[in-house]
């Protein structure tokens, strides 16, 4: 019962986490204009992984996609890649974990197979969560670096007369969504891995049955056979982990009233 609960909870937590990772990846507010200690502009800038937006005090919001691939910073490309890998792994993990759920019966699937699938999805969720956390952290680091660089050169001009005030960017909502979502996916993955241990059937201790034939004593030990197939308790963890690792390798606008905050 506890195993089913752990597995179910792990699935739900991972599902919420992956939904959050998808949401964060699609969000426009990865970096937002720093309003602290800045002249009060009637224009608010914010940027996402795919486009940058400008919201005017009039309520009009204009977003422009990054229509270049080669012209984008390598770090931004890396963040995009990490987030996409996280989403793909998470989605496959969800698919696998649905079939692995103890409460769902599919044909004559044995518990051992479900245990394998649970561990596989667990590992996928862990990697997915790590990808999201890494992606968000790389972007955050990029922001911090740029923030201090632009603070150092905040006022540029000739003869002390201020000509240009550089726009500084700070952490946007998407970063926090990404961190939380990545963490949830990671936790869900760990829960799935824990659930996997309880899913694999324990070895049944049968008494050795002796058959006497033509004076020779031959003992058949069912447990020994079970062990040799990889379902016995002595090798189950290693066997399932191998299966898990193998699977992992294979997967290698006019303004509206809500526009202005």
């Amino acid at each position: 019962m506890a195993v089913t609960a752990c597995q179910g909870l792990g699935f739900v937590v991972s599902l919420i986490g992956i939904a959050g990772i998808i949401a964060a990846t699609c969000m426009d507010q990865w970096s937002t204009q720093d309003l602290y200690n800045n002249p009060v502009t009637a224009v608010f800038n914010y940027q996402g992984l795919w486009r940058s937006c400008v919201r005017e005090s009039s309520g009009f919001t204009e977003c422009r996609g990054y229509f270049t691939l080669l012209g984008l910073p390598a770090m931004l490309q890396a963040v995009r890649a990490l987030m996409i890998v996280g989403i793909v792994l998470g989605a496959i993990g969800l698919l696998v974990s649905i079939f692995a759920l103890k409460c769902i019966r599919i044909g004559s699937m044995e518990d051992s197979a479900k245990a394998n699938m649970t561990l596989t999805s667990g590992i996928m969720f862990i990697v997915s969560g790590l990808c999201a956390i890494a992606g968000v952290s790389v972007f955050a680091n990029m922001l911090v670096t740029n923030f201090w660089m632009s603070t150092a050169n905040m006022y540029t001009g000739m003869g002390g007369m201020v000509q240009t005030v550089q726009t500084r960017y700070t952490f946007g909502a998407a970063l926090f969504v990404g961190w939380v979502a990545g963490g949830l996916t990671l936790i869900g993955g760990v829960m799935m891995c824990i659930a996997c241990r309880g899913l694999a059937p324990e070895e049944t201790n049968y008494k050795a049955v002796s058959y006497h034939a033509s004076g020779h004593s031959v003992a058949y030990k069912p447990g020994g056979f079970k062990a040799s197939t990889g379902f016995g308790s002595n090798t189950k963890n290693k066997k399932i982990y191998d299966g898990g690792a193998r699977t992992e390798d294979e997967v290698q606008s006019y303004p509206s009233k809500h526009d202005y905050v």
């Epitope: 009637a42 224009v43 005017e56 240009t164 005030v165």
Partner: antibody
């Protein structure tokens, strides 16, 4: 079609108060009050987000003037307190548009501060 | 506050003339986010409310004749009337639409020569 109609102007004594109204028909996200003293240029007074009610004022009017709106009546207001002779002007309400330009203006209402 | 300085303060011209009004801001009105300059031009005739001509320094408001054009970036901006018409005799104002408080230039009066 957006229409803006101001009212509430008139003669007031120095130190007195006056409330200007601007009836708004049509879609508006944010609104402004702009004034023009006789024979002088345009002077921006205040801005308001018509949905959140968030205001912003020019430094000269902070504390004396209050911009507000009534959602139910679709009306914009400018409450003017501690009026001075130099506040004598035609007051316009104007709608903010793309590029933060003011695309629709009212006909203006004259406020005269004199003893 | 941002200072907006217009020049000349007044000018005399004839119908058909090319007229240029300049506006200088004390700070750049260029927004890095969309590479647009938040400078607006208005026309005002005596006893009337101002009329929006140009926003984003060079974008013509709908219904405004194409003889009006705007240019410039950063701190220096220009309003040009390619061929002055009788109805164009008025006062023209530039406005900072980037920083609060929004500030207007002192105006340029275009009179008949």
């Amino acid at each position: 079609e957006v229409q803006l109609v101001e009212s509430g102007g008139g003669l007031v004594q120095p130190g007195g108060s006056l409330r200007l109204s601007c009836a708004v028909s049509g879609y508006t996200f944010s609104m402004n009050w702009v004034r023009q003293a006789p024979g002088k240029g345009l002077e921006w007074v205040a801005w308001i987000n018509m949905y959140t009610g968030e205001p912003t004022y020019a430094d000269d009017f902070k504390g004396r003037f209050t911009i507000s709106r009534d959602d139910s009546k679709n009306t914009l207001y400018l409450q003017m307190n501690s009026l001075r002779a130099e506040d004598t002007a035609v007051y316009y309400c104007a709608r903010s548009s793309r590029g933060n330009g003011f695309d629709y203006w009212g006909q203006g209402t004259l406020v005269t501060v004199s003893s | 506050d941002i200072q907006m300085t217009q020049s000349p303060s007044s000018l005399s011209a004839s119908v058909g003339d090319r007229v240029t009004i300049t506006c200088k801001s004390s700070q750049s009105l260029l927004n890095s986010g969309n590479q647009k300059s938040y400078l607006t031009w208005y026309q005002q005739k005596p006893g009337k409310a101002p009329k929006l001509l140009i926003y984003w320094a060079s974008t013509l408001e709908s219904g405004v004749p194409s003889r009006f054009s705007g240019s410039g970036s950063g701190t220096d901006y220009t309003l040009t009337i390619s061929s002055l018409q009788p109805e164009d005799f008025a006062t023209y104002y530039c406005q900072n639409a980037y920083y609060f408080p929004f500030t207007f230039g002192q105006g340029t009066k275009v009179e008949i020569k």
